[in-house]
Structure formats: structure tokens, C-alpha cells
Amino acid sequence: IVLRPSRVHNSEENTMRALTLKDILNGTFSYKTFFPNWISGQEYLHQSADNNIVLYNIETGQSYTILSNRTMKSVNASNYGLSPDRQFVYLESDYSKLWRYSYTATYYIYDLSNGEFVRGNELPRPIQYLCWSPVGSKLAYVYQNNIYLKQRPGDPPFQITFNGRENKIFNGIPDWVYEEEMLATKYALWWSPNGKFLAYAEFNDTDIPVIAYSYYGDEQYPRTINIPYPKAGAKNPVVRIFIIDTTYPAYVGPQEVPVPAMIASSDYYFSWLTWVTDERVCLQWLKRVQNVSVLSICDFREDWQTWDCPKTQEHIEESRTGWAGGFFVSTPVFSYDAISYYKIFSDKDGYKHIHYIKDTVENAIQITSGKWEAINIFRVTQDSLFYSSNEFEEYPGRRNIYRISIGSYPPSKKCVTCHLRKERCQYYTASFSDYAKYYALVCYGPGIPISTLHDGRTDQEIKILEENKELENALKNIQLPKEEIKKLEVDEITLWYKMILPPQFDRSKKYPLLIQVYGGPCSQSVRSVFAVNWISYLASKEGMVIALVDGRGTAFQGDKLLYAVYRKLGVYEVEDQITAVRKFIEMGFIDEKRIAIWGWSYGGYVSSLALASGTGLFKCGIAVAPVSSWEYYASVYTERFMGLPTKDDNLEHYKNSTVMARAEYFRNVDYLLIHGTADDNVHFQNSAQIAKALVNAQVDFQAMWYSDQNHGLSGLSTNHLYTHMTHFLKQCFSLSD
């Protein structure tokens, strides 16, 4: 149990106040983290509060400003990037968001040696992506879907690709579906370690069906947004990978990297690229039916000037119980011999663990094991491997950082973070300098987040980078809710839940219950992290109990739970929320006439299905930007879990699992349906179809749309949204305003 101090001593009670909705909407209690921008083994950059770019040397203890806020302000820069030779800085301004990761910007190059901006051969605008080579100061950038290379910032650009076309051919940047569902980046180009080669992906969307929606703006006529967006079963992008020698790019030209034969025989995806050395690269491919992944190691043949990917260097990863990997197929972390690597995949017991692959996957040496999961490999040095897992004290929603000594035999394991600030910190990530000489730990909770700097050899804490003192002081007179993380054992399934309880919670009283659900495959909601958010307010001020439950399909508890939902989304996720609610009622402090459920995106889908389950458990519920039919969602995501919507595959369950099919069942609940009209991700179409089905069934419901808003419902829409949902819930629970 994690109990947040509620400080209810009588002497203090009159100075304490509950959280208000305004607190949440204003971000009054938001926290800060500190991630060093490492530039060497012992140096990092950080943007100071007054916007200077400061270089810190850990070993000398010195710091100096490399770029003044005056220079930053002169071009309205909001971001920067130092070239590895430390001669130049790019300054980024005019940020313009596109999709989840992608944005365009204007870039200026500042010469640190003479304190002036580089004039002549300036960069075009707006640029879709720009990055320095890992060594020196070569620049690669993407402009109008084509890739350009500059040997030096003041040089003219060399155009590498010529076929880039808006919504048709994407070079060096992903199309919509690859950005959102496969790469999770705004870029699709990768420098080799010393900058000799540049690898890039080309995505051909020519044959992909287009989603079109109106953007109302404030002109007389709305404009139409067109996005090539493959829905389940539709034609997918065609991907090719090229590598070009950046020293003399005009001569050999781009070399296409061959696709493994077993992958190329049918529709496939490229999933990631990892450089090993300047002359060795590792590509990962995935069949469209995403249970087979191939990792292919390719070598540059100097005499032929080509990339050779021998079959002996193809490593196959296959799942017989679900899809390959977790949310994504894991990426390899290569060891110093530049051929063997460490990778997370399922062991024979169905838990994701670190394995060491030297020759074949069949001969992999398992490095971690147990009924818990290794989650991320941060760094491999010559003598240590740093990773995170949820092993400690058997809480799946925790993250601790471990070090395994790989230089000694047998390897020894040490938990770096488990006992550092045990009550405050149970959920960590880390950021390592070159050769793991130093690292930063960022603790996200359950207490107030704190970022610290550590010696990579001894693990000794060197200094606190950010401890959120202002936040700590601001919370001193706030009645925060209590939080507890526990588990339910039901029919051989473990359901972990987080319960957020009102500050003066009394087990003998009855409280309204709100279930907050996400529930998507490989997600996790029950995490030991700090948050002061809308549900904190609902517990603190409105006296609600809020519960989050991780049911079947969720992550980091083994494949049995994770793959339970394979090919049948919308069944067990909903069942498990309902089961948990029944268990919560049995606890005696829930008013069973006042139970609600709400969720966003996948959570909107689950909350809708739960409301329409016919159990009579829920009085009301909210779905924000829900999926309503898997036929409407992206191919890469949907097919990973559901297969194809074809008669000979899984069409039947595609049809059975829609929200529309259950329209009649909404008759006895209060339903609030919310969606942004410019949602590029879960299209407004989803809610339009729910609304149509409810109207056709003559079922009353409430709805709110947000004009020109995307899947995030940001800006002023956020305030309106949470205010609106608060009113809806208070009305449902008969709470006075």
C-alpha cells in the first residue's frame, strides 16, 4: 500500500484545502524532471530557467554558458542541438505540430567559433526533420519529403532523394501509420556511428486509401485534410531501406538493403534499424501477420560497395501464442564484439526477459528470469548491463534499475534503485552518458518526482538535479487523496488495481465509484507514479473513489495475461473491469447505485462496451474519442492483435466486437460520448457511427464534439472537456455543484 500523507491532524485541518478543478486545469501541481543532454562521458547540456544553454562538466564541477538566451531569443528558438564537434548549434523555431511525434520547424545554424549565424546556403523552411552526424558537423535534413545532406553547415546541400511527394512518397520521415504504430518517431533516417553512412527509409503510400475530414478553421469554406491511412485489411505502405555513403554521395548513390526472403514473400513491415559499427547495420522486419519478426545483420562489402545480409545472420523471433514482442518488437543492444547482442523476448515460461544472442536465437543465453519482466535495456558496457524491471517486491507497476556485471562469471545482479528512496521512489527511468560513466535517475513516484545524478562505476549519488521543492511546498496545505495499489485474485487471474480514496476516507461509509479504464493491449494503468490530476480532484474535493484496474491484455505480467486478448479484443478487457467492480462492491464502501466508468481512446471503447454489457452495474459513463469498430482503426495496430477482417481470418470477431452492435444495451445507462472532429488517429467516424446506431435504436444519450481538435483535445478544449465531464459525473452521482 502506498499512502500519501494526508496530514489530517486537527490542528492543521483548518489550513488544509481540497484540490479544485481549477488547480488541475492550471497545472498548479505539475512536476519537473531533469534529463541531461549528454555530450560526452562527463559533460551535459541543460537549458536553464532563464533560457541559457549551459554546459556542465561533472568532473571539474564547472559550468559555462555556450549559448545565451539573447541568441536564442533573436530567432525565437524553442530548441537547440549542438554539433558533435562543438562548432555549431542549430536553433529550432516556428514549431508547428503535425501528428503525435512529427512537426515542422525553421532552423538556424549558429557558429560558436565566431559568435555569428551561418550566412549563405541557409536552410529552407519549413524543415520536417534535421539532425547532426554523430561525429563532426555534417547535417542531414528532410524538406518536402526529400533528404538533403550538407558536409558543413555553410555548404550547399546535396539532394539524396528526388521522388518525395506530399502524401505519396516519404523519404527519411515516416508516413502516418509508421509514425504512430511502428517507429514511434518523427524520423526515419539513421547515421552510422561515425557518420560515414546514412540509412533511410522510403515509404510509398501511393495505393493507400485516404481518410478525409473537414477542418473548419474560420474561412468561408472548410478545408479537407487528407491522410493516407491504412485501416484494418487495407493496402499498406510499401517500405524500402537505402544506405548512402555520405563522404562521396554523388558517386555510388543510395544502396537498397535487401529484405529477407522469408519476409519479402508476403506483405511486411520494417520495424527498426540499429547501427552496430560504420560497416555493420541491423534491420528488423515483421510480417504483416505480426507473429514473425526477422532481425537481419548486414555488412558493407568494400570491394563491391554494397550491403550484404547473409542468411546466417538472420534471426527469427516467432510467437505461437500471440503477436511478436510486447507493444513493439524489442530492439537489440549490441555488445562490444559488434556481432552478439542482448534482446528482450519471451522465455519458455512466457515472461519477457533479457537474452544474449551470440550465434542463433535457439542458442540464446537467458540473462534474467523469474515471474516478472525485464522492461528496457538502457546500456551495455564492457563490464555491465543496465536494465529496468518490475521484479522488486513483486509489484508489476514498479520500475527499478538493475546492473548486471557481464564482465565476471557468473554474472552478478545488483538493484541500483530499490533502496534509494524506497517510499518516495518506486518507478524509475535512467539516462546514461557515454560509456555509462555517469547516469541520471528520474524517479516518477509514488512520491514527488526527483532527478539525481550518479557515478556510473560506484552508483554513488553525486547531486540532486531536480527535487520539485516548490511543488512540495505548494502541496503542504492540500488534502491529497490516499492511494493504494493492491491485487485481486479471480479465477487464476491476478487483477492489480489502484484505488484513489478521498482524504477522510472512512471504510464504514458509502462512496460513489468511478472506474478509469484504458485497457489496451500491452498497456499498464496501475503504476507507482505521482500524479495530481482530474481524478485526484474528484477524490479530494468531490469525495469519489476512483479505481484503475489492469486486466487481461495488459503488460509486464507475463504472456498468459498479455496474449489472452489475442484475436478477441473487447471481450476480456471488459469482463475484467466488471469483475473488479463486483469485488469493489464486496469491499463494502461502494455505493452500488452510483458507479461510473470512463476512458479515452481504447479506454473509450472499453468503457462503452462495459456500459453496454447489460450487467446493470454502471449508472453512467463517458467515452472520449473511442474506437467503435476495429475496421475503422489503423492496420498496423489493429491487425497485430486481431488478424485480418476477412472471412477466412477474423471478420466475425471484427463484426461482433463493435460498440454499434450493442446500441440497444445503452438504454438503461447515461452515456456521454465525446470526440474531436479533427482526430487523425481515432477518426470522428467512430463516434459518428455510435451516434447513428444509438439514434437508430432510439436510445437517448449525451454528446459533445470539439471542432478542429485532434485525439488529444488540447488547449481550451481540455478545460471545457474536464469541466463538462465533471458536471456530467456530479449529476450522475447526485453531487451538488
Partner: antibody, heavy 117, light 108 residues
Framework: EVQLLESGGGLVQPGGSLRLSCAAS????????MSWVRQAPGKGLEWVSA????????YYADSVKGRFTISRDNSKNTLYLQMNSLRAEDTAVYYC??????????WGQGTLVTVSS | EIVLTQSPGTLSLSPGERATLSCRAS???????LAWYQQKPGQAPRLLIN???RRATGIPDRFSGSGSGTDFTLTISRLEPEDFAVYYC?????????FGQGTKVEIK
């Protein structure tokens, strides 16, 4: 040693078609980008078209775009240039050259294409 | 497209003399993308200076390339009888690759 041998040139009427071939030997043909460069009688050199090693990307001068098609058969170590809708100004010696946009380090001896009525 | 202008059009020199050929680009090119070729009557061009001012395989060291930005030079330190030919510069930084109109080096 590296050899590039063009063939397929000749006399053709305006509007007609020709297919040039370039047989390569002495190097790993399938590893290199290849180009066609032409030279009108008594004039300078003009780059015409290029193709990357896999054949997956092609490039053309504006003067021939839509009329000429470059291709290759790596199994036969041969580069091709299909020329359609030929014009008098296409008259030239056509060279195949090893390279993409520059540093053409090996050239064939050339094949003459004459477009005349 | 980038226009390359070579000068002089013709250079009349005696064997043993130094030849300096100029190539000026209409926009910045840099030496990484500039090459020089030699062509003799009835023959195919031959690469002399590869992109990046590197001498091509088998080219004698009397040939050297220099320059940056828009101005480039091919220097033949001591002309040999076999060096009398037409010389072309070529840029490969921008599509389409373009050649200069050529400089003819003839025996005086």
C-alpha cells in the same frame, strides 16, 4: 579489367524508338549505380539518366523525361536505355558510365544514335 | 540547374608548361561534388579528378584539382604530349548533373 560495351545505336526517324544496351564486365555490376551520358556531334557532354544498383530508383534529365526509360538486368550485367518519341536533338553518341551523379570512373566507347528523316 | 562555365575556351601551351584550367559554377558546389574529365578525339571521356579533389586510379600526380564554393581549378604541372585534349568539369551536387562546355588544351 572493367569493360562497358554499348550497342543498339543507329539511324532512326523522328518519333521512332531505339533501345540501347550496355554490357558490363570486370566489376560487380549489381553493386553500382549506372548512368547514360550523351555527346552531340562537336558538342559537350550531357548527362541523360541514372539508375541505382538495385534498379529501384531512376533519374532523368528534363530533356528526356517521359520519353526515355532507364533499366537494368543485374542477372545479365546489362544496362538499358529505351528511347521513344525520338527527336533530331537526341542525335548524339550515347555513353554508358559507371556512377550515379558524378565521378564517372569508367565509360563505354559509345554508340551513335542518329535521328533524321 | 547549375551552369558550369569553363575558361579559357582554348589554351595554347607547349609541352613542359603548366596548364591552369578554370571552372566556375553558377551556384556553390564544393569540391566534394566536382570532378574533372579528359577527352581525346574519337574516345570516351576519362575521369581525372574524382569528387573530393582525389586523383582517379592511374592518373599521374601532375594532375591536381583545387577550389571550393564556385571557383575550381584543374592544374597540370608539366604538360606531356599525351595531355593535349579537351577537359570537362562536372558537378554532381544537384540534379541534373551538369558538365562545363570544355576547355581545349592544344599544342602551341
Amino acid at each position: 579489367e572493367v569493360q562497358l560495351l554499348e550497342s543498339g545505336g543507329g539511324l532512326v526517324q523522328p518519333g521512332g524508338s531505339l533501345r540501347l544496351s550496355c554490357a558490363a564486365s570486370g566489376f560487380t555490376f549489381s553493386s553500382y549505380a549506372m548512368s547514360w551520358v550523351r555527346q552531340a556531334p562537336g558538342k559537350g557532354l550531357e548527362w541523360v539518366s541514372a539508375i541505382i544498383s538495385s534498379g529501384g530508383l531512376t533519374y532523368y534529365a528534363d530533356s528526356v523525361k517521359g520519353r526515355f526509360t532507364i533499366s537494368r538486368d543485374n542477372s545479365k550485367n546489362t544496362l538499358y536505355l529505351q528511347m521513344n518519341s525520338l527527336r533530331a536533338e537526341d542525335t548524339a553518341v550515347y555513353y554508358c558510365a559507371k556512377g550515379w551523379f558524378g565521378g564517372f570512373n569508367y565509360w563505354g566507347q559509345g554508340t551513335l544514335v542518329t535521328v533524321s528523316s | 540547374e547549375i551552369v558550369l562555365t569553363q575558361s579559357p575556351g582554348t589554351l595554347s601551351l607547349s609541352p613542359g608548361e603548366r596548364a591552369t584550367l578554370s571552372c566556375r559554377a553558377s551556384q556553390s558546389v564544393t569540391s566534394s561534388y566536382l570532378a574533372w574529365y579528359q577527352q581525346k578525339p574519337g574516345q570516351a571521356p576519362r575521369l581525372l579528378i574524382n569528387v573530393g579533389s582525389r586523383r582517379a586510379t592511374g592518373i599521374p600526380d601532375r594532375f591536381s584539382g583545387s577550389g571550393s564554393g564556385t571557383d575550381f581549378t584543374l592544374t597540370i604541372s608539366r604538360l606531356e604530349p599525351e595531355d593535349f585534349a579537351v577537359y570537362y568539369c562536372q558537378q554532381g551536387i544537384m540534379l541534373p548533373p551538369t558538365f562545363g562546355q570544355g576547355t581545349k588544351v592544344e599544342i602551341k
